[in-house]
Interface confidence: medium
């Protein structure tokens, strides 16, 4: 997956820091105070649809075969720049009973972006 | 994740059968001859962005907090209807040396769709 460098407008991963205070979650998250969540942005022209990233690979490649051949309904189906690989992160937070929980939370950080 | 029923235009899972013969893969895939790959289609209005499906959950919810508050650059970032849960499927195929391989191939079947 591409890293966005400002030079390309093709689907890429953009760095982004999330502050838990900003989104009002500091009432239950103890640590960290925020993290690099990142996000995906950019164009997905038809020739790269289904070719980047990992997790959507087989399925998106199959669908792209139909799309490239103008097969209805895929010809008009827009390919999207989305997370294709996400990583977990460890968090310290309060449960409802104000007990402190330490847990690896799935799908927190975008590692790779690709065209769906 | 919603199943498309023709009544809604909100992001949903649409049934779709892939024929390996149609896409010219029957020269290396022995079985099955095709499968229900399914795909995602539909609108992702801002109020449902990041709210459906499972695998993008934490990350998309976090990003959606910023989007809903008109935070740049997310205000203009289009939310997409994409697979959020994929399922593997067992396949019988030839490898490059014409050996017959039986393997569970990841991410073949779309189980759920959601807004990124």
């Amino acid at each position: 997956g591409l890293e966005c460098d400002g030079k390309v407008n093709i689907c890429c991963k953009k760095q982004f820091f999330v502050s838990f205070k900003d989104i009002g979650w500091n009432d239950w998250i103890i640590a960290p105070s925020g993290y690099h969540a990142n996000y995906c942005e950019g164009e997905c022209p038809s020739h790269i649809a289904g070719t980047s990233g990992s997790s959507l690979s087989f399925h998106s490649t199959v669908i792209n075969h139909y799309r490239m051949r103008g097969h209805s309904p895929f010809a008009n189906l827009k390919s999207c720049c989305v997370p294709t690989k996400l990583r977990p992160m460890s968090m310290l937070y309060y449960d409802d009973g104000q007990n402190i929980i330490k847990k690896d939370i799935q799908n927190m950080i975008v590692e790779e972006c690709g065209c769906s | 994740g919603l199943e498309c029923d023709g009544k809604v235009n909100i992001c949903c899972k649409k049934q779709f059968f892939v024929s390996f013969k149609d896409i010219g893969w029957n020269d290396w895939i022995i079985a099955p001859s095709g499968y229900h790959a399914n795909y995602c289609e539909g609108e992702c209005p801002s109020h449902i962005a990041g709210t459906s499906g499972s695998s993008l959950s934490f990350h998309s919810t976090v990003i959606n907090h910023y989007r809903m508050r008109g935070h740049s650059p997310f205000a203009n970032l289009k939310s997409c209807c994409v697979p959020t849960k994929l399922r593997p499927m067992s396949m019988l195929y030839y490898d490059d040396g014409q050996n017959i391989i039986k393997k569970d191939i990841q991410n073949m079947i779309v189980e759920e769709c959601g807004c990124s």
Epitope: Y94, D95, D96, G97, I105 | G1, G53, S57, T61
Partner: antibody, heavy 122, light 112 residues
Framework: QVQLVQSGAEVKKPGSSVKVSCKAS????????WSWVRQAPGQGLEWMGG????????NTAQKFQGRVTITADESTSTAYMELSSLRSEDTAVYYC???????????????WGQGTLVTVSS | DIVMTQSPLSLPVTPGEPASISCRSS???????????LDWYLQKPGQSPQLLIY???NRASGVPDRFSGSGSGTDFTLKISRVEAEDVGVYYC?????????FGGGTKVEIK
């Protein structure tokens, strides 16, 4: 201080629908599990289903499938339960309950709404 | 569905005396992570239920230490070391190992 405030009592005709709301205040909304539990007069507690806004996943007990719709509006921190095709046996107090953050369906319910009495009568 | 069976149905108690309620599940509530997904709730007359014990043996915040939970797998017990007048109500066990979440039929505790 977390508070769950439910909508008021309802009297409904058989065959109609009812939509009960549960507005949360004093905390975050999306990472928690929001369940609906009902209690018929003089009976025990019965889980109907719930929703986890952070993942958008909803779950409904088989008994209510096709009749119950559970939704959540993050912008107003409100969970909703709509029950359709009402019959007299649906006369009960309906409670919303909040399960711990990021605990999925394996949640314990520390906070409960005050309950909403729904009476189904012709 | 997991069936939860409570006993006794009714429990007349004397203030200051101990009390014990049993809860049995139709399948083990012990997860591979080591937790028993069983909670105990008390519903006082005219009130909403309140959490007493979670994950089999952990007392919820603000719950007096006279309440304790024990057991593992399919057999669980809620004990009140010395019953007080304010403890009257219906006690429910609840399993959260798998959906649908299910409750026991309840045990009504009343003062003799």
């Amino acid at each position: 201080q977390v508070q769950l405030v439910q909508s008021g009592a309802e009297v409904k005709k058989p065959g109609s629908s009812v939509k009960v709301s549960c507005k949360a205040s004093g905390g975050s909304f999306s990472p928690y599990t929001w369940s609906w539990v009902r209690q018929a007069p003089g009976q025990g507690l019965e889980w109907m289903g719930g929703i986890i806004p952070i993942s958008g996943t909803a779950n409904t007990a088989q008994k209510f499938q096709g009749r119950v719709t559970i939704t959540a509006d993050e912008s107003t921190s409100t969970a909703y339960m709509e029950l359709s095709s009402l019959r007299s046996e649906d006369t009960a107090v309906y409670y919303c309950a909040r399960g711990g953050p990021l605990s999925g369906w394996r949640a314990s319910y520390y906070y409960w709404g005050q309950g909403t009495l729904v009476t189904v009568s012709s | 569905d997991i069936v939860m069976t409570q006993s006794p149905l009714s429990l007349p108690v004397t203030p200051g005396e101990p009390a014990s309620i049993s809860c049995r599940s139709s399948q083990s509530l012990l997860h591979s992570n080591g937790y028993n997904y069983l909670d105990w709730y008390l519903q006082k007359p005219g009130q909403s239920p309140q959490l007493l014990i979670y994950l089999g043996s952990n007392r919820a915040s603000g719950v007096p230490d006279r309440f304790s939970g024990s057991g593992s797998g399919t057999d669980f017990t809620l004990k009140i070391s010395r019953v007080e007048a304010e403890d009257v109500g219906v006690y429910y066990c609840m399993q959260a190992l798998q959906t649908p979440i299910t409750f026991g039929g309840g045990t009504k505790v009343e003062i003799k």
